[in-house]
């Protein structure tokens, strides 16, 4: 942590970017009859950042503080006025007390100054403690941020794993779908072949029936022909002729039937062969189908196990994500409480600085009263510029690399009976 020594006025400009009079005195505020103290406007401070999300809330706090400071300053002014009355009273007895005053100047600072010095030491000590505490809290915050990053990374890794598993599953599903489509296609092809067999059977049945009908018709015709010859003696010769003819016709018919039947048998054999081939093909397809079904079943098994694995992985992931979420919530709570604590410390710190500033001004006032001169009260520049306190920046990032620069202008006006007798300006540059 970088330490800086800054004056009370500079400290104000570090905390807030608003215009601020030294000690919160409004310009032109009367210190007493014949005397007025004013300070020139300070240049705006360098851009600053307070690295907290609560900065906005604190800003409102600072505004309230400024208001209370103004009230305190008004009260102090009133006290100044009463002190000046006392000084006037002392002026009347100036000669009597001059020696005593000289004696007091020569001496060590009063016991009152010692008391304030002791208080200041105590305040500085508290400030140092707060600074150390703030540094420790920052380290803790960094550690928490690191833990959070680790948890987030772990969560990301788990998510990646899950996505990978899902992609694998999608690929397996696609393979299973393709196998199913192949099986369905094969089934359709087998059914197509079986359909052809059904038609072939029908065609075969019809051909056989047709041939049987033809055969039956021919037999009736032959029987009629055979029954024709007349048995009368007169036609014996004709009968023998007819018998010879009938005999040869019978042979021809038989021959014709035989050849026709042979054709039929051939056709039947051909059809039977076609049927056998079709059945053989169907069996081949069935075998292929069985093997494909086996493949499909094994794929289904793989698929199911993968789905089971994925479910388990998802459950595990959900559980882990829940625990991460809890841890995250816990960390965020802790972070929030740390932020609140930091804000509290910052507030305390601010209050202490306010008290300290008030004390600084009061000490300066007392010192001036003790060093009071005969005709007027003037406040040398050194009084304010030498009042130095220690302060530690809460966040090194929030102070820019360049030095803080400010001008303090002390304007001294001497008035008598409402008229300005003497006016002087002194400019003091501070570089941090």
């Amino acid at each position: 942590m970088e330490r800086r020594r800054i004056t009370s006025a500079a400290r104000r400009s570090y905390v807030s970017s608003g215009e601020m009079m030294v000690g919160g005195l409004a310009p032109g505020r009367r210190l007493g009859p014949g005397t007025r103290l004013s300070l020139a406007r300070m240049p705006p401070p360098l851009p600053t950042r307070v690295d907290f999300s609560l900065a906005g809330a604190l800003n409102a706090g600072f505004k309230e503080t400024r208001a209370s400071e103004r009230a305190e300053m008004m009260e102090l002014n009133d006290r100044f006025a009463s002190y000046i009355e006392k000084v006037r009273f002392l002026e009347q007895q100036n000669k009597a007390l001059a020696a005593e005053l000289n004696q007091l100047r020569a001496k060590e600072p009063t016991k009152l100054a010692d008391v304030y010095q002791a208080e200041l030491r105590e305040l500085r000590l508290r400030l140092d403690q707060l600074t150390a505490n703030s540094a420790r809290l920052e380290v803790e915050r960094d550690n928490l941020a690191q833990d959070l990053a680790t948890v987030r990374q772990k969560l990301q890794d788990e998510t990646n794993l899950r996505l990978e598993a899902e992609n694998n599953l999608a690929a397996y599903r696609q393979e299973a779908d393709e196998a199913t489509l192949a099986r369905l296609d094969l089934e359709r092809k087998i059914e197509s072949l079986e359909e052809e067999i059904r038609f072939l059977r029908k065609i075969h049945e019809e051909e056989v029936r047709e041939l049987q009908e033809q055969l039956a018709r021919q037999q009736v015709h032959v029987e009629l022909d055979v029954a024709k010859p007349d048995l009368t003696a007169a036609l014996k010769e004709i009968r023998t002729q007819y018998e010879a003819m009938a005999s040869s016709n019978m042979h021809e018919a038989e021959e014709w039937y035989r050849s026709k039947f042979a054709d039929l048998t051939d056709a039947a054999a051909r059809n039977a062969e076609l049927l056998r081939q079709a059945k053989h093909e169907a069996n081949d397809y069935r075998r292929q189908l069985q093997s494909l079904t086996c493949d499909l079943e094994s794929l289904r098994g793989t698929n199911e196990s993968l789905e089971r694995q994925m479910r388990e992985q998802e459950e595990r992931h959900v559980r882990e994500a829940a625990s991460y979420q809890e841890a995250l919530a816990r960390l965020e709570e802790e972070g929030q409480s740390l932020k609140d604590e930091m804000a509290r410390h910052l507030q305390e710190y601010q209050d202490l600085l306010n008290v300290k500033l008030a004390l600084d001004i009061e000490i300066a006032t007392y010192r001036k009263l003790l060093e009071g001169e005969e005709n007027r009260i003037t406040i040398p520049v050194q009084t304010f510029s030498n009042l130095q306190i220690r302060e530690t920046s809460l966040d090194t990032k929030s102070v820019s690399e360049g030095h803080l620069k400010r001008n303090i202008v002390v304007k001294t006006v001497e008035m008598r009976d409402g008229e300005v007798i003497k006016e002087s300006k002194q400019e003091h540059k501070d570089v941090m």
């Epitope: 197509s192 079986e194 359909e195 059904r198 038609f199 059977r201 029908k202 065609i203």
Partner: antibody
């Protein structure tokens, strides 16, 4: 996507002829048997003809036997139905359909036989 | 030829109701390989028929699960668990066990 698109229908006089076509796509046409089915106006469906994948087996309904001829060109993925000696009772919407379950049908082509 | 008889011819329903259509064949539709080639189609006005259920109870691709088929031998049923507006049209049953293939006369599903 399986698609069957019939064409060739129209108005014809009794005794006249028409040749219907059915263009197939989206499946292995040469692997499946194909059918023609018709539907007379406001009537039911009537199966009329079958041809096997390799054209070796052909079968017709009795109502069209001897008048209609089914054929296919596997190289062109096309099914045909040559209709001759058309009668008024042949007036119908003609659909081609694939496979034993008639799983895919075309949108149909209308044939009107009228003098 | 196998005759397919569908009942009822018309089925008025309210949207969200269950609907049931029956189909009876003149012969058993169980083929020698054990399969039963009974299918259900829906034809919406001005469109071609679309396959819903094949081989008694298998839903065709893209068909909602509110459609289900059941039955065996010669008696079959198509059920729609909750009728939606898009389900309105004419439902046909068909058999491809026996050649020639034959269709039922159709059942018109309409709003009550």
């Amino acid at each position: 996507e399986v698609q069957l698109v019939e064409s060739g229908g129209g108005l014809v006089k009794p005794g006249g002829s028409l040749k219907l076509s059915c263009a197939a796509s989206g499946f292995t046409f040469s692997a499946y048997g194909m059918h023609w089915v018709r539907q007379a106006p406001e009537k039911g469906l009537e199966w009329i003809a079958y041809i096997s994948s390799g054209s070796s087996t052909i079968y017709y309904a009795d109502t069209v036997k001897g008048r209609f001829t089914i054929s296919r060109d596997n190289a062109k993925n096309t099914l045909f139905l040559q209709m001759t000696s058309l009668r008024s009772e042949d007036t119908a919407m003609y659909y081609c359909a694939s496979s034993y379950a008639l799983d895919y049908w075309g949108q149909g082509t209308s044939v009107t036989v009228s003098s | 030829d196998v005759v397919m008889t569908q009942t009822p011819l018309s089925l008025p329903v309210s949207l969200g109701d269950q609907a049931s259509i029956s189909c009876r064949s003149s012969q058993s539709l169980v083929y020698s390989n054990g399969n039963t080639y009974l299918h259900w189609y829906l034809q919406k006005p001005g469109q071609s028929p679309k396959l819903l259920i094949y081989k008694v109870s298998n839903r065709f691709s893209g068909v909602p699960d509110r459609f289900s088929g059941s039955g065996s031998g010669t008696d079959f049923t198509l059920k729609i668990s909750r009728v939606e507006a898009e389900d309105l049209g004419v439902y046909f049953c068909s058999q491809s066990t026996h050649v020639p293939y034959t269709f039922g006369s159709g059942t018109k599903l309409e709003i009550k």
